[in-house]
């Protein structure tokens, strides 16, 4: 008789999830010499241990601590690029501007980027049928807790001037319910971070509005200022310039350092 299985509202675990995580880990440690010491089998075991046999609505940050420990990585704290609702462009930027880092340029972020996973209570099976949706089911699911944990740690590590890329084409340019707005903003350390500089990316070719005057940007400025961190906002009008550089990565002069 087939065992009854919980139906969640979100998509199930990404197919070939274990193989994907392991392959990504091997690839990352080959490309990044400072992470060559990492044992990818141990990383996978720690990742698996965070959610396998556990109720997928009852995951805690503590569950991920063994993985966090294995994935400990030092990135230059003054070269951090946060983003909200504009992931692809942020990644194109750091692909060219190699000395800046998004969370997904770190080992743990790279492992989990665009993947979904969850298990089931009291069974060692991975659920490939469905996983909890953050809104419809529960917020303490394996994916949400993972990103909350790594995002918090990433923000806590930042120093000096921290940049955040925001999507000027969205109705809420700054959304306090996003990972940036709910986690990263509140975990920047005022004793280490001097300034948060927001880059508001414009979509339209002829767009010449000053989106730094948007009410949601004023809200972000207020939150940041109350935390004793200076705030700066810049309108960025030609995102196609990132793509032109990505198409020619061999051009070493295609960086902001001149």
């Amino acid at each position: 008789v087939p065992r009854w299985r919980q139906q969640w509202s979100g998509p199930g675990t990404t197919k070939r999830f274990p193989e994907t995580v392991l392959a990504r880990c091997v690839k990352y440690t080959e490309i990044h010499p400072e992470m060559r010491h990492v044992d990818c089998q141990s990383v996978w075991d720690a990742f698996k241990g965070a959610f396998i046999s556990k109720h997928p609505c009852n995951i805690t940050e503590e569950d991920y601590q063994p993985l966090m420990k294995l994935g400990t990585q030092t990135v230059p704290c003054n070269k951090i690029l946060l983003w909200s609702r504009i992931k692809d462009l942020a990644h194109q930027f750091t692909q060219v501007q190699r000395d800046m880092f998004t969370l997904e340029d770190t080992l743990l972020g790279y492992l989990a980027d665009d993947l979904t996973w969850c298990g089931e209570f009291n069974t060692s099976k991975i659920n490939y049928q469905s996983c909890p949706d953050w809104r419809k089911d529960c917020s303490n699911n394996p994916v949400s807790v993972f990103w909350k944990t790594v995002s918090r740690r990433f923000a806590e590590a930042a120093c000096d001037v921290v940049h955040v890329m925001l999507n000027g084409s969205r109705s809420k340019i700054f959304d306090k319910n996003s990972t940036f707005g709910s986690v990263e903003v509140h975990n920047l350390q005022p004793e280490k971070v001097q300034t948060l500089e927001a880059w508001v990316i414009h979509g339209g070719r002829e767009d010449s509005r000053d989106l730094c005057q948007d009410p949601t940007i004023k809200e972000l400025e207020s939150i940041i200022s109350k935390r004793n961190i200076q705030f700066s906002c810049k309108n960025i009008y030609r995102p196609d310039k990132f793509l032109q550089c990505v198409k020619n990565p061999e051009d070493s002069s295609c960086t902001s350092e001149i």
Epitope: D207, S208, C212, N235, R238, Q244, C245, K247, C254
Partner: antibody, heavy 120, light 107 residues
Framework: QVQLVESGGGLVQPGGSLRLSCAAS????????MNWVRQAPGKGLEWVSG????????YYADSVKGRFTISRDNSKNTLYLQMNSLRAEDTAVYYC?????????????WGQGTLVTVSS | DIELTQPPSVSVAPGQTARISCSGD??????VYWYQQKPGQAPVLVIY???KRPSGIPERFSGSNSGNTATLTISGTQAEDEADYYC??????????FGGGTKVEIK
Amino acid sequence: QVQLVESGGGLVQPGGSLRLSCAASGFTFSSYYMNWVRQAPGKGLEWVSGISGDPSNTYYADSVKGRFTISRDNSKNTLYLQMNSLRAEDTAVYYCARDLPLVYTGFAYWGQGTLVTVSS
Amino acid sequence: DIELTQPPSVSVAPGQTARISCSGDNLRHYYVYWYQQKPGQAPVLVIYGDSKRPSGIPERFSGSNSGNTATLTISGTQAEDEADYYCQTYTGGASLVFGGGTKVEIK
């Protein structure tokens, strides 16, 4: 090293046409926005026109819109400015300038300029 | 369109500090660039992105941008710094603007 060399300037009568060229070397030409900036004798700098690397996007100052056309040939590493219906106030040194990459929109490198004189 | 306003001239004694202002509405929301131009020569970028110095530009050149005003500061001015200086910004579309220029004279 980056080099920009303008050519095609000269004396032209009002209402006439001229085509300026800018030969680029020392960088991946197609990765960058390119621009024309001019400077009338004894005056300040005025941006004239810009073009994206691919080259789908073109931009013009109001003072030249409808009269000037910017274009580029990435296979020849060359930037062009076709100037029609020229007026006396178009008299200036015309500079070709390479844009900064990524989030910056300023001019990292300039050519030495070519003089355009519009006079009868 | 934003308009950038610069003083026509700034006079400074050798070794002293020259400050050139560039003002425009909400200028802090846009990156500002500074160019040096000597007679008969093409402009040279001395500051980009408000405060960054291109390689080869002496450390005595610095920039800042807050409120409605960007400032180019030349500390310990030298005779070779005598030139015209232009600020520039970009406010989207076809709105790429220069200030009117400031002549720096070393007394």
